[in-house]
Interface confidence: low
């Protein structure tokens, strides 16, 4: 009679995490008598997965009725597979005795576990940066298997090319992580921009995972200032405005200086938003020129988002405005932003 063979028909089996794996094993003879055991790995450190004769293996069930006397199918199903279950599984026939002795092993079935990558997490720099500067974004995703993975970076739908990606660990592992760093050059129009990290993996069936970062959290667009003198509103009154344009974020404080002395400080509140996401704001002063003998230097000083102040000045020519006879006192304030100069 032909000697018993242990047949494991599948060289490899691939299963998604959370599913059940069926590992096939049949024997060609009922002789010699003795139990079947399943192991993960070979050699002295192998791990017992199932013993037909005894033991408690809650995740393992037999596919056929292995207790029947004539049964020659010893396939098993392992439930709720995780990446940690990956490895080569051997179906081993033992000869009955005291103790039982190993008789013959199957060739082994390699179980690989497909585990989805976690949602990519994109993080930007800790501090804001201004246009024309290059900033770094990182993208991380974890827990996937197999190791093969593709990562792409986009800015507003345009693929980026300046990035470096690593998959860890380099050697064999039950699951893997990917870490990528992309460099992005900021422009003044980037308040509404998004940086996207896209991860493609065999487990995702062609539907990649994406992580995003809004550049509004990264960019600081410094304001441009313009101080202008408006036409005379009433006799001897000049309206001076400070236009603060194209700034982001909104946090801004403006100080008016008259000949270097602080006149008024205010915080940007009722700003207008531009299409590109930046803001504009305007502050104004009403100056009673009749109260002045000399020219006045008006300075609009702006502190934006905690940065060093920027300023713009305007020289108000008092001599160009005829003074009213006997008018030695300044006119009353006529608005929240009006200012009389003494």
């Amino acid at each position: 009679e032909e000697e018993l063979q242990v047949i494991q028909p599948d060289k490899s089996v691939s299963v998604a995490a959370g599913e059940s794996a069926i590992l096939h094993c049949t024997v060609t003879s009922l002789i010699p008598v003795g139990p079947i055991q399943w192991f993960r790995g070979a050699g002295p450190a192998r791990e017992l997965i199932y013993n037909q004769k005894e033991g408690h293996f809650p995740r393992v069930t037999t596919v056929s009725e292995s207790t029947k006397r004539e049964n020659m199918d010893f396939s098993i199903s392992i439930s709720n597979i995780t990446p940690a279950d990956a490895g080569t599984y051997y179906c081993v026939k033992f000869r009955k005795g005291s103790p039982d002795t190993e008789f013959k092993s199957g060739a082994g079935t390699e179980l690989s576990v497909r585990a989805k990558p976690s949602a990519p997490v994109v993080s930007g720099p800790a501090a804001r940066a201004t246009p024309q500067h290059t900033v770094s974004f990182t993208c991380e995703s974890h827990g996937f298997s197999p190791r093969d993975i593709t990562l792409k970076w986009f800015k507003n739908g345009n693929e980026l090319s300046d990035f470096q990606t690593n998959v860890d660990p380099v050697g064999e592992s039950v699951s893997y992580s990917i870490h990528s760093t992309a460099k992005v050059v900021l422009t003044r129009e980037d308040v509404h921009s998004q940086v996207i990290c896209e991860v493609a993996h065999v487990t995702l069936q062609g539907d990649p995972l994406r992580g995003t970062a809004n550049l509004s959290e990264t960019i600081r667009v410094p304001p441009t200032l313009e101080v202008t003198q408006q036409p005379v509103r009433a006799e001897n009154q000049v309206n001076v405005t400070c236009q603060v344009r194209k700034f982001y974020p909104q946090r801004l404080q403006l100080t008016w200086l008259e000949n270097g002395n602080v006149s008024r400080t205010e915080t940007a509140s009722t700003v207008t938003e531009n299409k590109d996401g930046t803001y504009n704001w305007m502050s104004w002063l009403l100056v009673n020129v009749s109260a002045h003998r000399d020219d006045v230097k008006l300075t609009c000083q702006v502190e934006h988002d905690g940065q060093p102040a920027v300023s713009k000045s305007h020289d108000l020519k008092v001599s160009a405005h005829p003074k009213e006879q006997g008018s030695n006192t300044a006119a009353e304030n006529t608005g929240s932003n009006e200012r009389n100069i003494y």
């Epitope: 993975i149 990528s180 065999v202």
Partner: nanobody
């Protein structure tokens, strides 16, 4: 250490076909991408074709598009370059290269992206 072993090169006539093979040996190895480069006598090494291990659309040098096909056999752990309608300008030493982790956008045409290289297999196309 990983070694890449190429085979399949040889002397052929114009219009003939060849299939090059590349088999990583050493430790169990999975790359992000595999590529073929070539170097003609007296010229710089140039990109020919690349494919991701995970699959997707391969990338080719313009002059070989439609004639060359890069493919992989994951079960055999082997990569191939099927070269049809060979021309004299296809002559050179063909190198297999492996990019272990992704170094840039898409499939790298830059040899500096590749971590491992084979010794090369010569292909001569005579007219």
């Amino acid at each position: 250490h990983v070694q890449l072993v190429e085979s399949g090169g040889g002397l052929v006539q114009v219009g003939d076909s060849l299939r090059l093979s590349c088999a990583p040996s050493g430790r169990t190895f999975r790359a992000y991408a595999m590529a073929w480069f070539r170097q003609a006598p007296g010229k710089e090494r140039e990109f020919v074709a690349a494919i991701r291990w995970i699959g997707g659309t391969p990338s080719y040098k313009d002059s070989v598009k439609g004639r060359f096909t890069i493919s992989r056999d994951n079960a055999r752990n082997t990569f191939y370059l099927q070269m049809n309608s060979l021309e004299p300008q296809d002559t050179g030493v063909y190198y297999c290269a492996a990019e272990e982790t992704q170094k840039g956008s898409g499939l790298g045409h830059d040899g500096r992206h590749y971590d491992y290289w084979g010794q090369g297999t010569p292909v001569t196309v005579s007219s």
